[in-house]
C-alpha cells in the first residue's frame, strides 16, 4: 500500500455569492490528520497520531498554504457561470501517492454540489471528464477560468503535484508516518433474535490499517456471503478503525461457530459466548 | 491455566461397562464442546465424535454409534464417555479434547488407558 | 470419508536440522488443516491450525504450508523437545480424520 496525502477543500456559495469561510481536511495514509474549518483556519491535527507527526513548529506553515489554497478555489467558485439560488458547494481533492518502488502518482479532482465534473492527471497534466453535459459544461467553465489566471494560480494549480509530493515526504521523514500496524480488539457478542434464534456480532475495533478480514465460519469453514451482514470499516477518532460482522444461529449452536479474523499478516479466531454470558474475548493471539 | 484432567486407568472385561470422566478448569465449560479421540495401541487418532456442553447435544461418528454415550455433569466441568459391552478391540486410550469451533482440538486431557480382556 | 495420509511413519533427523513432514488428503479440502504433537509420554498439543496458523505458545520454529491435497509442517531448527509423534487433521468435512502419524527421531 503506497503511502499517501490527501486534501479535501470545500467552499460554499449562497444565493450565487461565495462565502468567506471554507473547509479543508487532510488525510495522511488513509488516516485524518489535518482540519481547517470554515471560521479560522488552524491546522488542528486529528489525535495524537498527527501532534506526533506535525509537532507544534509547523501548524503556521500548514495553516498559511491551506489559507492559500481555500482562497484559489472560492475564486474558481466565483467563475461558475450557473450558479443558482440556495446553497451549491465547489470541492478540490487533490490526492499524491508514494509507491515502494518510489514511483509517484497525483491527481485533482473538482466535484460541484457533490457531483465529480473534472479530473486532472497531476504527472500528465491530462483532464478528463464525465460525459453528461452539465459536467462537461462546469468542466470547460473552470478550465478556462484556470487558464485566464495561471498567473494567479500557477502555485496551486501548476506546482501542486510537487508541492503534495514535497509536504509527503517531509510527513514521511519527521519518522512517524511509518507503516505502523495497530492490531484489532476483537469480541463477540450475542443478542436474542426470533424465537430460538439469536444473533452474533463480531466487532473488531481500533485497528490500523484499515484492511481487514472480518468473518463468521461454521464448524471451521467460512459461512457463505449471503448469511453474513457486514458493517463498512469506519475511523473511531483515535487514528484506527472499526468494524463488524454478524449472522444469525439457531440457539444452543453458538460451539460450532467462530469468528474470524485477518489483520496486517496476523489472523486470530473468536468463539461465541454461550447462554447468558454476554462478551467472550478469545484466547487466541 | 486451561487444563483437561482424566480419570485414571481402567482395566474391564469382556461384555462390561466403562465409564471415563474429563474435569475441565481454568474456562467456561459450557462455552466449548468436548470431543473425544480413541488411539488404540501403536496407531492413530480416530475421532470418536463431541458433546455439545451447553444443550447437552451428543454428535457420534458413524463406527461410535450404539455402544458409545458422551453425557455431561455441568455443575461440576465434567464430562463423560461410556462404553457400553466391551470388546477386546476397545483396548486404547481415550482422550478427551476442548472442542473450538467444532473443528479444533485445542486442549487435550492426559488420556485414560483402558484395557479390556477377555 | 475423507483419507488423510502421512507417508512417512518415522523420521530421523539431526539437532539444527530442518525437517519436513507432509500429510495429503484424499480430496481437496481448502486449507482447512490442523496439526498436532504427541510427546512420547502420550501428552497432545496443538501447534498449528488452519494450514499455517501458529496457536498460542509454539515455538516459531514451526511452520505450515500447503493447498488442495497437499500440506506440510515444518520445523526449521529442531531441537531436544521436537522429538515426538506428529498428526494432521481435516475439518472440510465430518467425520473428522487424523493422518497416521510421523514420529519424529534424533539420529
Known amino acids: 500500500e503506497p503511502h499517501s496525502l490527501r486534501y479535501n477543500l470545500t467552499v460554499l456559495s449562497w444565493d450565487g455569492s461565495v462565502q468567506s469561510g471554507f473547509l479543508t481536511e487532510v488525510h495522511l495514509d488513509g488516516q485524518p490528520f489535518l482540519r481547517c474549518d470554515r471560521q479560522k483556519c488552524r491546522a488542528k491535527p486529528q489525535g495524537q497520531w498527527a501532534e506526533d507527526v506535525l509537532g507544534n513548529k509547523t501548524w503556521d506553515r500548514e495553516t498559511r498554504d491551506l489559507t492559500g489554497n481555500g482562497k484559489d478555489l472560492r475564486m474558481t467558485l466565483a467563475h461558475i457561470k450557473d450558479q443558482k439560488e440556495g446553497l451549491h458547494s465547489l470541492q478540490e481533492i487533490r490526492v499524491c501517492e508514494i509507491h515502494e518502488d518510489n514511483s509517484t502518482r497525483s491527481s485533482q479532482h473538482f466535484y460541484y454540489d457533490g457531483e465529480l465534473f473534472l479530473s486532472q492527471n497531476l504527472e500528465t497534466k491530462e483532464w478528463t471528464m464525465p460525459q453528461s453535459s452539465r459536467a462537461q459544461t462546469l468542466a470547460m467553465n473552470v478550465r478556462n477560468f484556470l487558464k485566464e489566471d495561471a498567473m494567479k494560480t500557477k502555485t496551486h494549480y501548476h506546482a501542486m503535484h510537487a508541492d503534495c509530493l514535497q509536504e509527503l515526504r517531509r510527513y514521511l521523514k519527521s519518522g512517524v508516518v511509518l507503516r505502523r500496524t495497530v492490531p484489532p480488539m476483537v469480541n463477540v457478542t450475542r443478542s436474542e433474535a426470533s424465537e430460538g434464534n439469536i444473533t452474533v456480532t463480531c466487532r473488531a475495533s481500533g485497528f490500523y490499517p484499515w484492511n481487514i478480514t472480518l468473518s463468521w465460519r461454521q464448524d471451521g469453514v467460512s459461512l457463505s456471503h449471503d448469511t453474513q451482514q457486514w458493517g463498512d470499516v469506519l475511523p473511531d477518532g483515535n487514528g484506527t478503525y472499526q468494524t463488524w460482522v454478524a449472522t444469525r444461529i439457531c440457539q444452543g449452536e453458538e460451539q460450532r461457530f467462530t469468528c474470524y479474523m485477518e489483520h496486517s499478516g496476523n489472523h486470530s479466531t473468536h468463539p461465541v459466548p454461550s447462554g447468558k454470558v454476554l462478551v467472550l474475548q478469545s484466547h487466541w493471539q | 491455566q486451561i487444563q483437561l484432567v482424566q480419570s485414571g486407568p481402567e482395566l474391564k472385561k469382556s461384555g462390561e461397562t466403562v465409564k471415563i470422566s474429563c474435569k475441565a478448569f481454568g474456562y467456561t465449560f459450557t462455552n466449548y464442546g468436548m470431543n473425544w479421540v480413541k488411539q488404540a495401541p501403536g496407531k492413530g487418532l480416530k475421532w470418536m465424535g463431541w458433546?455439545?456442553?451447553?444443550?447437552?447435544?451428543?454428535t457420534y461418528a458413524d463406527d461410535f454409534k450404539g455402544r458409545f454415550a458422551f453425557s455431561l455433569e455441568t455443575s461440576a466441568s465434567t464430562a463423560y464417555l461410556q462404553i457400553n459391552h466391551l470388546k477386546n478391540e476397545d483396548t486404547a486410550t481415550y482422550f478427551c479434547?476442548?472442542?473450538?469451533?467444532?473443528?479444533?482440538?485445542?486442549?487435550w486431557g492426559q488420556g485414560t488407558t483402558l484395557t479390556v480382556s477377555s | 470419508d475423507i483419507q488423510m495420509t502421512q507417508t512417512t511413519s518415522s523420521l530421523s533427523a539431526s539437532l539444527g536440522d530442518r525437517v519436513t513432514i507432509s500429510c495429503s488428503a484424499s480430496q481437496g479440502i481448502s486449507n482447512y488443516l490442523n496439526w498436532y504433537q504427541q510427546k512420547p509420554d502420550g501428552t497432545l498439543k496443538l501447534l498449528i491450525q488452519?494450514?499455517?496458523l501458529l496457536h498460542s505458545g509454539v515455538p516459531s520454529r514451526f511452520s505450515g504450508s500447503g493447498s488442495g491435497t497437499e500440506y506440510s509442517l515444518t520445523i526449521s531448527n529442531l531441537e531436544p523437545e521436537d522429538i515426538a509423534t506428529y498428526f494432521c487433521?481435516?475439518?472440510?468435512?465430518?467425520?473428522?480424520?487424523f493422518g497416521g502419524g510421523t514420529k519424529l527421531e534424533i539420529k
Open positions: 488452519y494450514t499455517s
Open positions: 479434547a476442548r472442542n473450538y469451533g467444532n473443528y479444533l482440538f485445542d486442549y
Open positions: 487433521q481435516q475439518y472440510s468435512k465430518f467425520p473428522r480424520t
Open positions: 458433546i455439545n456442553t451447553y444443550t447437552g447435544e451428543p
